[in-house]
Structures are given as structure tokens and as C-alpha cells.
């Protein structure tokens, strides 16, 4: 015969644990029901009555089955350099990510705590490593035979056009100028662009990220002005 199903609250057998979505209440010494995501424990269980759950209030949430007395507060509103990629609901926290042209300089949990503008490489420098969601652009000087005449977070160094007759030799920040009507070989008009950072969680992710064990808040404090790094501009 199948064992009789115990209804919460109940005293567990010695050495056994409570079932899924139940917890052991030390005071009552009983297995009691957890509250579902979006709820919290309004009244804890006793030996004779089960947990009383209540819905989370506005701007608060619980993401897991729980028996917390109060729901967690959602993070503050996303700042001007962020976009809200997940709204605050009773079951999930707000998640803010950096808007295009910015990267996340500080994120220890979901979302971003501190956004910073992607570095722009000045003329004579090109993008060596594009920015990602969590890393800044790396600039490098244009090698001999290449140039960049833009201030950009996406442009790489391009080869000088090859002339039949050179009017003005190219340098790191300027293309060669030809005297003939058309050069022997020329790059297509317009700057060469690297793709914008794709919306991945991190530049360095593990194949199977482990579940986060701590609640996330995602508010941001303003960054002050930054002096330009080598080969870059703060504009």
C-alpha cells in the first residue's frame, strides 16, 4: 500500500528531510509549506497551522520558493545610460544593462552597477579589440601602411590606397593622395566598421554558468569625467 501523504504541517520522520517546496521550521519543529515566487511568508507555521503566504507589494519581488518575512526590494530605476532589459515584477528584479556605446564597468551579479562610455580611438589609432558588454575598446597605433582618420569606437586601421603616382604620402592618420585620376587599388569608400558589441552577458562566460545564489540589485551611481587613455578620446 502506498504511504499516506502527509499534509503540512507535519513532523518529519527522524533522519528524513522535508519534501520539495517545504522547509523545516525550527520553532514549530515541523515541515511547512514554502511560499511561491511572488509571495512571502506573512505568518509562519505552528504545530497546528501551515505557513500563511501573501503577495509581494509593488516594487518588491521574490524569485524563488521561499519563507522570507518580507519580499526583496527591486533595484532603483535604470539610469540614463542604461536600458531596462527586465522589468520589476513580483517574481523578478529589474535588470538594467548599458545602452549602445557604453559597457558595463562593474557587474558582480545580473545587470549592471556602473556603465562607462566605450573608448573612442583618435585619428592615427584604430580598434585593436572591440568593446563588449563588459569590456572597453582597446586602441592600437596604426601600423606603417595603414591609417585611421576618425575618432571612433568601431573603426579599425585601413590600408593606404596604392597610387600610380603619389601626390601626398599617407601617414597614420591620413590616406595617401594620388595624382592620377584613379589609384591602382583603393579601399571601398567609407570607414571600415567593426560590429557593435553583441548582447552577451560577459566577455568571459563559462559554458554552463552556475545559478546565482544572491538577489540582484542594479542601481547605478554617476561616473565623473574621464581623461582620455593613450590613443583614445573622452569625447
Amino acid at each position: 500500500l502506498p504511504a499516506q501523504v502527509a499534509f503540512t504541517p507535519y513532523a518529519p520522520e527522524p533522519g528524513s528531510t522535508c519534501r520539495l517546496r517545504e522547509y523545516y521550521d525550527q520553532t514549530a519543529q515541523m515541515c511547512c509549506s514554502k511560499c511561491s515566487p511572488g509571495q512571502h511568508a506573512k505568518v509562519f507555521c505552528t504545530k497546528t497551522s501551515d505557513t500563511v503566504c501573501d503577495s509581494c507589494e509593488d516594487s518588491t519581488y521574490t524569485q524563488l520558493w521561499n519563507w522570507v518575512p518580507e519580499c526583496l526590494s527591486c533595484g532603483s530605476r535604470c539610469s540614463s545610460d542604461q536600458v531596462e532589459t527586465q522589468a520589476c515584477t513580483r517574481e523578478q528584479n529589474r535588470i538594467c544593462t548599458c545602452r549602445p556605446g557604453w559597457y558595463c564597468a562593474l557587474s558582480k551579479q545580473e545587470g549592471c552597477r556602473l556603465c562607462a562610455p566605450l573608448r573612442k580611438c583618435r585619428p592615427g589609432f584604430g580598434v585593436a579589440r572591440p568593446g563588449t558588454e563588459t569590456s572597453d575598446v582597446v586602441c592600437k597605433p596604426c601600423a606603417p601602411g595603414t591609417f585611421s582618420n576618425t575618432t571612433s569606437s568601431t573603426d579599425i586601421c585601413r590600408p593606404h590606397q596604392i597610387c600610380n603616382v603619389v601626390a601626398i604620402p599617407g601617414n597614420a592618420s591620413m590616406d595617401a593622395v594620388c595624382t592620377s585620376t584613379s589609384p591602382t587599388r583603393s579601399m571601398a569608400p567609407g570607414a571600415v566598421h567593426l560590429p557593435q558589441p553583441v548582447s552577451t552577458r560577459s566577455q568571459h562566460t563559462q559554458p554552463t554558468p552556475e545559478p546565482s545564489t544572491a538577489p540582484s540589485t542594479s542601481f547605478l551611481l554617476p561616473m565623473g569625467p574621464s581623461p582620455p587613455a593613450e590613443g583614445s578620446t573622452g569625447d
Epitope: 557587474s107 552556475e210 544572491a214 561616473m223
Partner: antibody, heavy 120, light 106 residues
Framework: EVQLVESGGGLVQPGGSLRLSCAAS????????MGWVRQAPGKGLEWVGS???????YYANWAEGRFTISRDNSKNTLYLQMNSLRAEDTAVYYC??????????????WGQGTLVTVSS | DIQMTQSPSTLSASVGDRVTITCQAS??????LAWYQQKPGKAPKLLIY???KLASGVPSRFSGSGSGTEFTLTISSLQPDDFATYYC????????FGGGTKVEIK
């Protein structure tokens, strides 16, 4: 007692590999962001890399591609796999536990360190 | 990468002195800065985090201030146990340490 204990250091030839371990007692490592910091003899502190609770990792530029941080929850241990070692990687390697929360990265619990010597 | 510059590199002081160490970031790091104390052969010890918050168990004679790019660690009255090397650390994703300040006996 809450503590971190590093092991796995020693003498290794240039180009060789080594795996450092950081075993925790008194705390559950899976609840904390963790990191590795090294210190060459007579020099200052240098960050190697950090790992978030969800498994996402960040590395110093010089460590990218050569060093890997992993964790075994069942053993409550953090690892640092070091490949293609160079003489300049000679240092005491410390593991550190982050203060918690989602603010800045700071280490408020450190191991005693393990010495890695890269020499032929 | 953000560069952290500490000054001075060495500081000679006497017990009871008020000591100030500065740390400059090459770009704004908001308040995300920590200070550590390290003694020879020992692991670093966290003193201050988020620029001004005192870590657990740290004496109140240690204090921190600053935001953006300029930060200061102050020891209000130097004690014999305070002779050590002090490091600042910016706490954003790609962590960076200052070069250190050795506080020695005058």
C-alpha cells in the same frame, strides 16, 4: 573557523602548467564571488582574475587565454589553472573571497598564499 | 586599463602621527575603491571599501575619503601595529592595485 587554504604551488619549468587550489572551510564558496591575486617577490599586489557566483569570469589582460578560474562546489574549492608559464609568473598566489553584495570587488578574506616559481 | 597611482611610495612617521596616503585613478571609478594593509610574509587585510566604509574589525583611527579619481587613506594617530605597506585597489570588473605605500618608523 572560516578560512581559505591555497595549495599546488611549487617549481615549474617555463612553458609548463600548474593548477592551484583554494579550499574553503567554514563558508560555502558558491555563495561568494572569488578571485586570485598574486605578488612577485618584493613587488606589489597584482590582480589575476575573478569569478562571479553565476560562473562568469573576468581576467587581467595579461592572464587572458593562459589562466582559467574554475570552482568545484562539491569540494568547496576554487582553482586557478595556469598554462604556458613564464619566469615573470613567479609569485605568491593568493585566493580571496569577495565581501558580498553587488557593489565593488573587494576581498575581505584571504588565504595564506602559495609560492609558484617558474625557472629552468 | 585603469591605472592606480599611490603616493608617497615610502613614508617615515612616528607613533602618534597623523598619516595620509593618496591614490589617484586614471579615470573615474566613482566610489569603488578599497584600502588594504599588508605586513611582510602575510596576506593583505581589507581596511576600507567603497572609499569610506570601515571593514569589520578595523580600528576607527583608519578612515577613507574621496570619489571619482582622487582618494585618501588617513590614520589619525599612528600605532606601533600600523607600520606596514598599504595598497589602494579599484573595485570595478577589471580590478587594479596601486603600487603600495610603505609606512616605516622615522
Amino acid at each position: 573557523e572560516v578560512q581559505l587554504v591555497e595549495s599546488g604551488g611549487g617549481l615549474v619549468q617555463p612553458g609548463g602548467s600548474l593548477r592551484l587550489s583554494c579550499a574553503a572551510s567554514g563558508i560555502d564558496l558558491s555563495n561568494y564571488a572569488m578571485g586570485w591575486v598574486r605578488q612577485a617577490p618584493g613587488k606589489g599586489l597584482e590582480w589575476v582574475g575573478s569569478r562571479r557566483t553565476d560562473g562568469i569570469t573576468y581576467y587581467a589582460n595579461w592572464a587572458e587565454g593562459r589562466f582559467t578560474i574554475s570552482r568545484d562546489n562539491s569540494k568547496n574549492t576554487l582553482y586557478l589553472q595556469m598554462n604556458s608559464l613564464r619566469a615573470e609568473d613567479t609569485a605568491v598566489y593568493y585566493c580571496g573571497r569577495d565581501v558580498g553584495g553587488d557593489g565593488g570587488w573587494y576581498f575581505n578574506l584571504w588565504g595564506q598564499g602559495t609560492l609558484v616559481t617558474v625557472s629552468s | 586599463d585603469i591605472q592606480m597611482t599611490q603616493s608617497p611610495s615610502t613614508l617615515s612617521a612616528s607613533v602618534g602621527d597623523r598619516v595620509t596616503i593618496t591614490c589617484q585613478a586614471s579615470q573615474s571609478i566613482n566610489i569603488y575603491l578599497a584600502w588594504y594593509q599588508q605586513k611582510p610574509g602575510k596576506a593583505p587585510k581589507l581596511l576600507i571599501y567603497d572609499a569610506s566604509k570601515l571593514a569589520s574589525g578595523v580600528p576607527s583611527r583608519f578612515s577613507g575619503s574621496g570619489s571619482g579619481t582622487e582618494f585618501t587613506l588617513t590614520i589619525s594617530s599612528l600605532q606601533p601595529d600600523d607600520f606596514a605597506t598599504y595598497y589602494c585597489q579599484q573595485g570595478i570588473n577589471n580590478i587594479g592595485f596601486g603600487g603600495g605605500t610603505k609606512v616605516e618608523i622615522k
